[in-house]
């Protein structure tokens, strides 16, 4: 955790006046001046009744305030006298002294209250050297501390038992610890006083630092009896448009020409391509123009534009119907969902002066007329020797971002003219053990004379398919077997080529000893 | 084109029925008869019938009366063999065909305990 | 029923060069229509029959023409003219005449 922060109450090393504190009796302590190791002059306060026995020797410091503190630490310093080094002296000779400490709500002591005794004066510890010294070393300075809590009152005195060990008590400080305001987790937490015990954990709630958010709660830290942070709860981290510094101490601001589009730990990042921040602390980078973002992008994409036109668009008429194919755009606006929308305009009129209008509805596409994949696409259904516009757009995921239409290329197309239209309907008129004869009506739309017409017709059973063709609008099939069902289909021929075969409609031979008689029947398409 | 998608291999017991399936797709599906062929692992083929999809109009191979039932469900271009009270014998390779033209890949039907 | 009667192997026959597989029936298979209901396939190991030949000599749509069939009401005949590896399978006749649609035995074309 953080190194922890200790508060002085009192100290004497820093007193160079008297410090008269009270010693009872007064043939006790003593107060002296003397010289710390570092030769600065303090005031000291000595006993060595070594030579009487029953010693009880007391000494009080002033009132020390409390400073709402639950636990206070005693530092001494000391000398001890070894007993061994001292001649012809008594057995009680003590190498020891008691530490006591008396609370109050003000300073009320005097030189006979409380009493110079345990009870009411509270023991902390008896106190013992690490060394001692005799008359022929340097005195070694003992270095002690303790403490003792919690405190409720006021203030407090702190009182030393000599009961007959040859001593000096060079310093006293008084003080309490703290934990250090710090910043953890992007969170920031007060400087807090430790607790009564010395395993008490005082709980100090943080806030998010400057442009922080939180990301779990509480926020809380634990102050130890030491002074020292342990155990985080909850964290903040950096909101969008900042990012870590300092250690995580800090969440800074994304510069100009950077950004984050995420609250959180990660830092500031270029912007993508084709887009810009103009102030700091952006949490996405605005598109240039003519350059968009599409609903589906993420802030972390590039912003891209509308691609340039198909290229290459190449028609092949067929009659009515035809087929165009295209190149891919020279240009794909830097996005890989590019699709393609044809729109048919049929035009009236004669060379520049012709006005154009969109299709009709019974104008089909094959795959489809938009959002196409493929570079090509199958249309029929236009009327013959008629003018038309065909218009291929590429489009992609921002172009209905641009306030634009998208780019296309056209090309300009005349039909030809057209193949019949289906044959309607088949009547049986007819039929046999080994024989079908079939009459239909001509196409509704012949589009020019009729040559012949061809007849396609397989066993269901085998479904495999003969040819057989007619100049007139009826037939007789023969070879076929009895009992068996005939799957048969007609189409019409002009000098435009085929037309298309009529819907598959069924009939049926009789069995080899049947009459053959006639069957009149109009066969609907199945 | 024309595509003929027969159900998955199957592992049956003994005695009970089993119903394999055959997808027709690419063409009109009533205007062709479905044939039903079987093939023991190596033997040769057996014809077992057809049916016509336009009316399940049916013709059986006598030896598989009574031990197969053509169906069809027009709706969803599907024909349908049933096989009942099966022994180790009905353990063959079924396979369905669009007349004398195109032929299933085939379902492995295993009768065994 | 029709029996239709095919031998099991064929002579073994090089690569390149040309084979025969023969097949019989029980009943002449010419129709009065003038057609004759004989149909060959070839099963590829693993794979599902495949049509080679319909009413006799009709080559099926999609068939190399290395591939003929022949023959009178009852003896039929199929040949490759130059056999290739992916000609490798059992090859069966079919008659189409009558119920119920018998095949023959089928004949493994075997190369040398």
């Known amino acids: 955790g953080c190194r922890a922060l200790e508060e002085t109450l009192m100290d004497t090393k820093w007193v160079t006046s008297e410090l008269a504190w009270t010693s009872h009796p007064e043939s006790g302590w003593e107060e002296v001046s003397g010289y710390d190791e570092a030769m600065n002059p303090i005031r000291t306060y000595q006993v060595c009744n070594v030579r009487e026995s029953s010693q009880n020797n007391w000494l009080r410091t002033g009132f020390i305030w409390r400073r709402d503190v639950q636990r206070v630490y005693v530092e001494l310093k000391f000398t001890v006298r070894d007993c061994n080094s001292i001649p012809n002296i008594p057995g009680s000779c003590k190498e020891t002294f008691n530490l006591f400490y008396y609370e109050a709500d003000s300073d009320v002591a005097s030189a006979s209250s409380p009493f110079w005794m345990e009870n009411p004066y509270v023991k902390v510890d008896t106190i013992a050297p690490d060394e001692s010294f005799s008359r022929l070393d340097a005195g070694r300075v003992n270095t002690k501390v303790r403490s003792f809590g919690p405190l409720s009152k006021a203030g407090f005195y702190l009182a030393f038992q000599d009961q007959g060990a040859c001593m000096s008590l060079i310093s006293v400080r008084a003080f309490y610890k703290k934990c250090a305001s710090t910043t953890a987790g992007f969170a920031l937490f007060p400087e807090t006083l430790t607790g009564a015990e010395p395993t008490s954990l005082v709980i100090a709630p943080g806030t998010c630092i400057p442009n922080a958010v939180e990301v779990s709660v509480p926020l809380k830290l634990y102050c130890n009896g030491d002074g020292e942070w342990m155990v985080p709860v909850g964290a903040c981290t950096c909101a969008t448009g900042h990012e870590p510094a300092a250690k995580e101490s800090q969440c800074r601001p994304c510069p100009p020409g950077s950004y984050k589009a995420k609250q959180g730990e990660g830092p500031c990042l270029p912007c993508p391509p084709n887009s810009r921040t103009t102030s700091p602390a952006a949490s996405i980078c605005t598109c240039h123009n003519n350059f968009y973002r599409a609903d589906s992008d993420s802030a972390d994409s590039a912003c891209t534009t509308v691609p340039s036109p198909p290229r290459g668009v190449i028609s092949n008429v067929n009659e009515t119907s035809l087929i165009l194919e295209w190149s891919e755009p020279r240009d794909l606006g830097g996005r890989d969902d590019l699709l393609y929308n044809v729109i048919c305009k049929k035009c009236h009129g004669a060379g520049g002066a012709s006005a154009c209008s969109r299709c009709d509805d019974n104008v089909e596409f094959v795959p489809r007329q938009l959002g196409l994949t493929e570079r090509r696409v199958h249309i029929s259904h236009l009327l013959a020797h008629t003018r038309y516009t065909f218009e291929v757009q590429a489009v992609n995921g921002v172009s209905g971002k641009s306030p634009l239409p998208p780019r296309y290329a056209a090309v300009n197309i005349t039909t030809n003219q057209a193949a019949p239209s289906e044959v309607p309907t088949l009547r049986l008129h007819s039929s046999s053990g080994s024989s079908l004869t079939l009459s239909w009506a001509p196409p509704e739309r012949p589009n020019g004379v009729i040559l012949d017409y061809e007849m396609k017709y397989f066993e269901k059973s085998e479904g495999i398919a003969s040819t057989v063709t007619s100049q007139m609008n009826s037939v007789q099939l023969d070879g076929l077997r009895p009992d068996a069902r005939y799957v048969v289909q007609v189409r019409a021929r002009t000098v435009a080529g085929y037309g298309q075969y009529s819907r598959p409609a069924e009939f049926e031979t009789t069995s080899e000893r049947g009459s053959g008689a006639q069957q009149l029947q109009e066969q609907l398409p199945l | 084109q024309v595509q003929l998608q027969q159900s998955g291999a199957e592992l049956v017991m003994p005695g009970a029925s089993v119903k394999l399936s055959c997808k027709a797709s690419?063409?009109?599906?009533?205007?062709?008869?479905i044939h039903w062929v079987k093939q023991r692992p190596g033997q040769g083929l057996e014809w077992i019938g057809e049916?016509?999809?336009?009316?399940?109009?049916?013709n059986y191979n006598q030896k598989f009366k009574g031990k197969a039932t053509l169906t069809v469900d027009k709706s969803s271009s599907t024909a349908y063999i049933q096989l009942s009270s099966l022994t180790s014998e009905d353990s063959a390779v079924y396979y369905c065909a669009r007349g004398a033209e195109y032929w299933g890949q085939g379902t492995t039907l295993t009768v065994s305990s | 029923d029709i029996v239709m009667t095919q031998a099991a192997f064929s002579n073994p026959v090089t690569l390149g060069t040309s084979a025969s597989i023969s097949c019989r029936s029980s009943k002449s298979l010419l129709h009065s229509n003038g057609i004759t209901y004989l149909y060959w396939y070839l099963q590829k190991p693993g794979q599902s029959p495949q049509l080679l030949i319909y009413?006799?000599?009709n080559l099926a749509s999609g068939v190399p023409d290395r591939f003929s069939g022949s023959g009178s009401g009852t003896a039929f005949t199929l040949r490759i003219s130059r056999v290739e590896a992916e000609d490798v399978g059992v090859y069966y006749c079919?008659?189409?005449?009558?119920?119920?649609?018998?095949f023959g035995g089928g004949t493994k074309l075997e190369l040398k």
């Open positions: 009413r006799m000599s």
């Open positions: 049916i016509d999809p336009s009316d399940s109009y049916t």
């Open positions: 079919m008659q189409h005449l009558e119920y119920p649609l018998t």
């Open positions: 690419g063409y009109t599906f009533t205007s062709y008869y």
